[in-house]
């Protein structure tokens, strides 16, 4: 018996087609993805093949103005229109709190939304009961398939799930649910979830009874053969893991932003064992037409967005590199721009001794969600900025000891190279890392811009001195693993909305040209 699994993950509000780098579509003939194009391809496959499942591995929420304005209603509407069969909860589904998940999505979705390792407690337990499930058994042709969901246990550090949801270890939570499905004679089981490729592989290895793992969160691109676009494969598609009980378990992920449709064909024997698996992500480029009916619906929903955010704020004459390939690995000029805006927003001439009360900014690279192309006449709109800073956070003022900052910069590179979001972009700071040293001892130079000076210059960080720093509220609250900031901050004052800070700065400057200028170096 053959099953076709179509899958998406980390779509992040890319309902409309995008440029190749997943930013706003500029040249329509070269644009990719979007739900109208996705629907064309899905329907084509559904017509051609008998047993098809369309699955999403989480993080539909957050990423463009679509989410800023519609807050998840757009996700439910268009996923319903595409007839998704199931979705796993991602960490970003909690960005607007539990209510922001329940009302627009959980109550409106016509497909099951899954997570086995999220347990509700307190007053929320009865309110959310049945709105998401640990697993769902789906009819596919004459057979049934069990889909069991999971969500990153780091979600409380990455989003806003509140205090009444407990995120358990994925493997510990999944095993009893899979066992239950086996007891119920469901012998074809897909683990669908949002914890990243490393966890996906562990699930394939450790959870007895899981036949296929469909993942997300790490934006992993897998491909067999010559890749069709710019993404470099992290491995073959599917990635085969040998489980502890000796089975070959295919693991897949489909990059992000709706640029690809994952396409996996699995052949099962009569006992539900995987005999073979093959496939590849399908690049959703302009050779695939956008479905006219879905496109018309998109255009109808788009009207509200146009009113919201299409006025020009200012211009850029350089490419604003907000790609994860840059901002999670090295100094990026988008990070510099945002940090400069954050400092500018906090200019308060204190007295004759201080040129300003604060000179430093830190910003998690993972919070920068999109680049901005200067080739669109250099125009920057609120909409562009909403794709870069989609989380609706604030840029806050904290007071920290130098020793805490040093710990933060060590944390910034403690697992460098895995494209994780904690890599820090900076302003008013010069940092030098030596990655040949062991984690926790990689910061070899950390100089900070003086405030008590008439001519600002960089001096070595002093461990016992108290510094003011501007940072996202996400970091102040210990997000991305920066627990030391949350635990050790001496004062925290909440600030202005992030997009507003940057838009005000761009409007003030009129023309911007941020550079990469040696704020972050590697020795």
């Amino acid at each position: 018996w053959e099953l076709t699994i179509l899958h998406t993950n980390d779509v992040h509000s890319r309902l409309e087609q995008t440029s190749e780098d997943s930013s706003k579509c500029v040249n329509a003939s070269r644009c990719m993805g979007g739900v109208a194009r996705l629907f064309t391809k899905v329907q084509q496959i559904r017509r051609a093949e008998p047993n098809v499942l369309l699955l999403d591995a989480g993080d539909q929420y957050q990423g463009t103005i679509w989410f800023t304005v519609y807050k998840g209603a757009e996700v439910a509407h268009f996923m319903n229109a595409l007839r998704y069969d199931a979705m796993a909860l991602g960490n970003h589904e909690f960005d607007n709190g539990v209510e922001g998940l329940i009302e627009p999505l959980l109550k409106e979705a016509k497909f099951p939304i899954l997570s086995a390792n999220i347990k509700a407690k307190g007053p929320l337990a009865s309110q959310i009961s049945g709105l998401y499930l640990p697993y769902k058994v789906l009819p596919v042709g004459d057979e049934v398939v069990g889909i069991v969901g999971y969500t990153s246990k780091e979600t409380p550090f990455l989003s806003n799930p509140g205090t009444n949801l407990v995120f358990e270890d994925e493997i510990t939570a999944l095993q009893p649910e899979v066992d239950k499905l086996k007891t119920l004679n469901v012998n074809k089981i897909i683990a669908l979830g949002h914890s990243g490729f490393e966890t996906d592989k562990l699930i394939a290895q450790k959870v007895r009874g899981v036949d296929v793992v469909v993942g997300g969160h790490s934006n992993t691109f897998l491909y067999t053969g010559n890749p069709p676009s710019k993404e470099v494969p992290a491995g073959k598609y599917p990635f085969i893991v040998t489980s502890d009980d000796g089975r070959k378990v295919p693991v897949v992920q489909a990059y992000a932003f709706g640029k690809y449709l994952g396409y996996l064909k699995i052949e099962f024997d009569e006992r539900g064992n995987v005999i073979s698996s093959h496939g590849n992500p399908i690049l959703l480029n302009s050779s695939i037409p956008e479905d006219p009916s879905i496109k018309a619906d998109i255009n109808k929903w788009r009207i509200k967005l146009d009113n919201y955010s299409t006025q020009e704020l200012g211009k850029t004459i350089v490419y604003l590199d907000g790609s994860s390939q840059s901002c999670r690995f090295r100094e990026c000029n988008m990070g510099n721009l945002i940090c400069d805006a954050m400092i500018n927003n906090n200019l308060r001439h204190a007295d004759e001794m201080f040129w300003n009360h604060v000179s430093m900014c830190i910003l998690n690279g993972g919070g920068i969600r999109s680049p901005i192309d200067e080739r669109n006449n250099g125009t920057i709109t609120w909409e562009n900025l909403a794709a870069v800073l989609p989380f609706g956070g604030t840029f806050d003022l904290v007071q920290l000891k130098g020793s805490t900052l040093k710990k933060a910069f060590e944390h910034s590179v403690h697992r460098y190279g895995q494209s994780t979001g904690e890599f820090l972009q900076v302003g008013g700071i010069h940092v030098v890392y030596d990655l040949s040293r062991k984690p926790g001892d990689r910061v070899v130079k950390l100089d900070v811009l003086c405030t008590k000076c008439r001519v600002p210059s960089y001096d070595p960080l002093k461990m016992d001195e108290i510094y003011k720093v501007i940072l996202p509220n996400f970091l102040a609250n210990g997000g991305d693993g920066f627990q030391m900031i949350k635990d050790e901050l001496l004062r925290h004052d909440s600030g202005d909305q992030d997009i507003n800070v940057v838009s005000t700065y761009i409007s003030k400057m009129k023309v911007i040209y941020p550079a990469v200028e040696g704020r972050i170096k590697f020795s």
Epitope: D85, K110, F111, P112, G130, L133, K136, L138, P139, L181
Partner: nanobody, 128 residues
Framework: QRQLVESGGGLVQPGGSLRLSCAAS????????IGWFRQAPGKEREGVSC????????YYADSVKGRFTISRDNAKNTVYLQMSSLRAEDTAVYYC?????????????????????WGKGTLVTVSS
Amino acid sequence: QRQLVESGGGLVQPGGSLRLSCAASGFLLDYYVIGWFRQAPGKEREGVSCISGSDRSTYYADSVKGRFTISRDNAKNTVYLQMSSLRAEDTAVYYCAADPSPVTVQAMCLPRFPVPYWGKGTLVTVSS
């Protein structure tokens, strides 16, 4: 081989009663949410009543509330639908369905999501 087999249908006069049975073979109904659905000629299939396996909570469509009663006998691996005060508009093919997923009885009956197991149906005709 998993099977749901409905029985008990037939011709009944308006105001009369019938008891439908749904017998399961190949799986234990204790772990399943079970639903009775019906489809009248030229109409969409609709959920009539559903019962959970765990707490035996029940759900009834507004059109049958107070007239139909769903129950289950796990020892016999059977679910029943007691129908009384029958009306002409109750005429339909009645289907039994089962889902091992932990869906609510309301979600099962709407049905909000696809249901994996179905019987072949039994015809109920209410006519004088």
